[in-house]
């Protein structure tokens, strides 16, 4: 650690003294002090002097002697007053810079150490400090305002009594900064502007902060437009706008927009797109297929996609058959702005029965015109079986009808015993029929295929079973042939209801 | 070794506020002055004022009424602003640190051209 | 214009001395102490000397600085090609209370 002769820890001297500080260390030492005239520095090896043969009350303050080669950066440290009857103030600073929260150090050294007792901070004029203003003082450094607040941000004098009279000294003004989380805030609005070709647009840019240092701009295509900036400050943050008004656009209005905001801190920008159309316009479209296929007792929602301008000026689902003539309860209707020229409307078909197959059609209009958009819903169904016993040109024959969507397909399975379904160890015989006949096909209906089975003779100690299946699920019906004439078996599960 | 950078904006628009940031790099920015310096062709060296960590501020009294300089010791960076720009302000402008006692400037960034126009 | 008062150009040859000098007045070098900055084209001043004769480490002993009254003076001895630069004095001014400079002297080694 570095040694400083005279080695006392304040000295005290009058105007127009001569004052030698010798700094002694292992290596080469530097001095730091206050900015402060006419002291000659004279540095040689390890000793650096430090002399003034004319000292003044502007000499006052801590003159530190440190090592700059020591790693643990010991220092050494005087305190010179010059005691001036007339400067009871040596103020190191025209302003002090701090941020909000901050404690302020005001450089108000006293010259005299004697006058510690008599003095004060005040505001500049004699104002008194504000309430709540929280400061403390020493002789060496001065007035410090604890936590500092923005609204402290005033000039202020120091304070001495001397003979029984206040002696100020000059004013130091204080600036206490907001401290700026980040760039300012932004708003464009709108997020997404359409009109057409004549009609008025605005473009709205603005930008906040705490601090009144920032800068916003409003570009059009990367062109800064010049726009007239309006200034406000409310709920503690200062707010610049710029506001584009168009009376008549054209297509060269249309293109990219961005609110650009930059501060100490940095910069933030947000963009919109413009768009300048020839003539009202109306696109329906969805992102789903418009035939649709569902399981009966399912639900399902049909959505809409909506892009217009001008808005819309009505909407409708209807249903067009063509099993009723109901229509989709509007409570099962809803719609969501994506933004201000994106709308989805959705229709919710819940657990939806066999007469609400069929054509949904979501109709909008606007001063475009009208739109409309058609769904087809097929419902799907398991297959219904049934076989009976007949003569088809006098030859005994099996009939099975089956009935569901998707088409079934169809299998006869022959087996032993008397049973409602033919496990895999009595099947003594299995016919795929690949080519049922089609009796019914028509939209939104069940399709109803029929295949035949000719048997010669029925035998008695058998079962014979028709099985239909599809992409939904099975059915089957076993016929049991018994003396008094043929005997039925629908499976005990059947039959399915929706 | 101690490094100062400066940073900000090459151009600057009449009537506009000049911001730099010096970063000071290699050793604390406690403890010490900081200071701005600049240079025009048809002015020299000018001295624009100083800092000390705890905010303590001079300035050039030809310059004061203009003039806010800030200091940020977490992040080791201090910053000057000089307000109502003309062309009068275009210079290369320097960060140093003051050596007070007898003022010198013992470290200069690499200094930074500010053009004011429009 | 410079508070402190320097000659625009000063010249010399390899191994030549060569002194710059630097006036001003009381309130400035009368009363303070002078200090020297050199500037190698398109780079920022470099301190040579403070506190009228005195050499941060690295400056060769070449250099010095002496101060009479109001005036200061450089003097660079052996003068070698890459001296070739602008000079600045620099001193503290009581009336500004802050540092002023010279307008700086361009040294060219012929």
């Known amino acids: 650690i570095p040694v400083i002769e005279p080695s006392v820890p304040e000295l005290v001297v009058k105007p127009g003294a001569t004052v030698t500080l010798r700094c002694v260390g292992n290596g080469s030492v530097e001095w730091d002090g206050p900015p402060s005239p006419h002291w000659t520095l004279y540095s040689d090896g390890s000793s650096s002097i430090l002399s003034t043969n004319n000292a003044t009350f502007q000499n006052t303050g801590t003159y530190r002697c440190t090592e700059p080669g020591d790693p643990l950066g010991g220092s050494a440290a005087i305190h010179l007053y010059v005691k001036d009857p007339a400067r009871p103030w040596n103020v190191l600073a025209q302003e002090v810079v701090v941020f909000e929260d901050q404690d302020a150090l005001l450089p108000c050294l006293l010259t005299d150490p004697v006058l510690e007792a008599g003095v004060s901070l005040v505001r500049v004029r004699g104002r008194p400090l504000m309430r709540h203003t929280n400061y403390s003082f020493s002789p060496w450094h001065g007035f410090t305002i604890h936590r500092a607040k923005f609204i402290q941000s005033q000039d202020y004098q120091c304070s001495a009594l001397m003979g029984g009279r206040k002696v100020m000294s000059i004013s130091i003004r204080l600036k206490v900064q907001k401290v700026i989380p980040g760039p300012p805030a932004l708003t464009l609005v709108p997020a997404e502007l359409v009109r057409i070709r004549g009609e008025a647009a605005q473009i709205v840019c603005s930008a906040s902060s705490v601090d009144v240092n920032f800068d916003v701009f409003l570009q059009h295509n990367n062109t800064k437009l010049a726009i007239p900036q309006q200034s406000d400050f409310h709920n503690n943050r200062y707010q610049k706008v710029l506001t584009l008004n168009l009376d008549q656009v054209d297509f060269q209005h249309a293109g990219n927009y961005s609110c650009v905001a930059s501060n100490v801190q940095g910069k933030h920008s947000t963009s919109m797109f413009f768009r300048v159309v020839e003539s009202a316009y109306l696109n329906l479209s969805s992102e789903q297929n418009l035939i649709q296929e569902v399981t009966v007792g399912e639900g399902l929602n049909l959505k809409v996609m909506v892009e217009a301008y001008p808005g819309l000026q009505g909407f409708n689902w209807t249903y067009l058959g063509p099993f009723s003539d109901h229509q989709p309860e509007p409570k099962l209707a809803n719609a969501t702005t994506k933004d201000t020229y994106r709308h989805t409307f959705t229709l919710s078909l819940p657990r939806l029965k066999p007469s609400e197959a069929g054509r949904y059609s979501f109709l909008a209009r606007n001063p475009g015109g009208w739109r409309a958009l058609t769904f087809e819903l097929t419902l799907r169904y398991p297959p219904e079986v049934s076989v009976i016993w007949t003569f088809i040109n006098g030859s005994g024959t099996l009939l099975c009808a089956a009935s569901g969507y998707p088409q079934p397909n169809v299998t006869w399975l022959q087996c032993s015993g008397h049973t409602d379904r033919c496990d895999e160890a009595q099947v003594l015989q299995v016919w795929d029929d690949p080519y049922p006949e089609v009796l019914s096909q028509e939209p939104f209906h069940k399709v109803t295929v029929q295949s035949l089975l000719t048997v010669e003779t029925l035998e008695h100690n058998q079962t014979y079973e028709c099985r239909a299946h599809n992409s939904v699920g099975s059915g089957s019906w076993a016929f049991i042939p018994i003396s008094a004439g043929a005997h039925t078996h629908p499976p005990d599960e059947f039959l399915f209801t929706p | 070794q101690v490094q100062l950078q400066e940073s900000g904006p090459g151009l600057v628009k009449p009537s506009e506020t000049l911001s730099l940031t010096c970063t000071v790099s290699?050793?604390?920015?406690?403890?010490?002055?900081w200071s701005w310096i600049r240079q025009s062709a048809g002015k020299g060296l000018e001295w624009i004022g100083h800092i000390y960590t705890s905010g303590s501020t001079n300035y050039n009294p030809s310059l004061k009424s203009r003039v806010t300089m800030s200091v940020d010791t977490s992040k080791n960076q201090f910053s000057l602003k000089l307000s109502s720009v003309t062309a009068a302000d275009t210079a290369v402008y320097y960060c140093a640190r003051e050596r007070t006692v007898v003022t010198y400037f013992d470290y200069w960034g690499q200094g930074t051209l500010v053009t004011v126009s429009s | 214009q410079s508070v402190l008062t320097q000659p625009p150009s000063a010249s010399g040859t390899p191994g030549q001395r060569v002194t710059i000098s630097c006036s001003g007045s009381?309130?400035?070098?009368?009363?303070?102490?002078v200090n020297w900055y050199q500037q190698l084209p398109g780079t920022a001043p470099k301190l040579l000397i403070y506190s009228n004769n005195q050499r941060p480490s690295g400056v060769p002993d070449r250099f010095s600085g002496s101060k009479s009254g109001t005036s200061a003076s450089l003097a660079i001895s052996g003068l070698q090609s890459e001296d070739e630069a602008d000079y600045y004095c620099?001193?503290?001014?009581?009336?500004?209370?802050?540092?002023?400079f010279g307008g700086g002297t361009k040294l060219t080694v012929l």
């Open positions: 009381s309130s400035n070098i009368g009363s303070n102490t």
């Open positions: 620099a001193a503290w001014d009581d009336s500004l209370n802050g540092p002023v």
């Open positions: 290699g050793g604390s920015i406690s403890s010490y002055y």
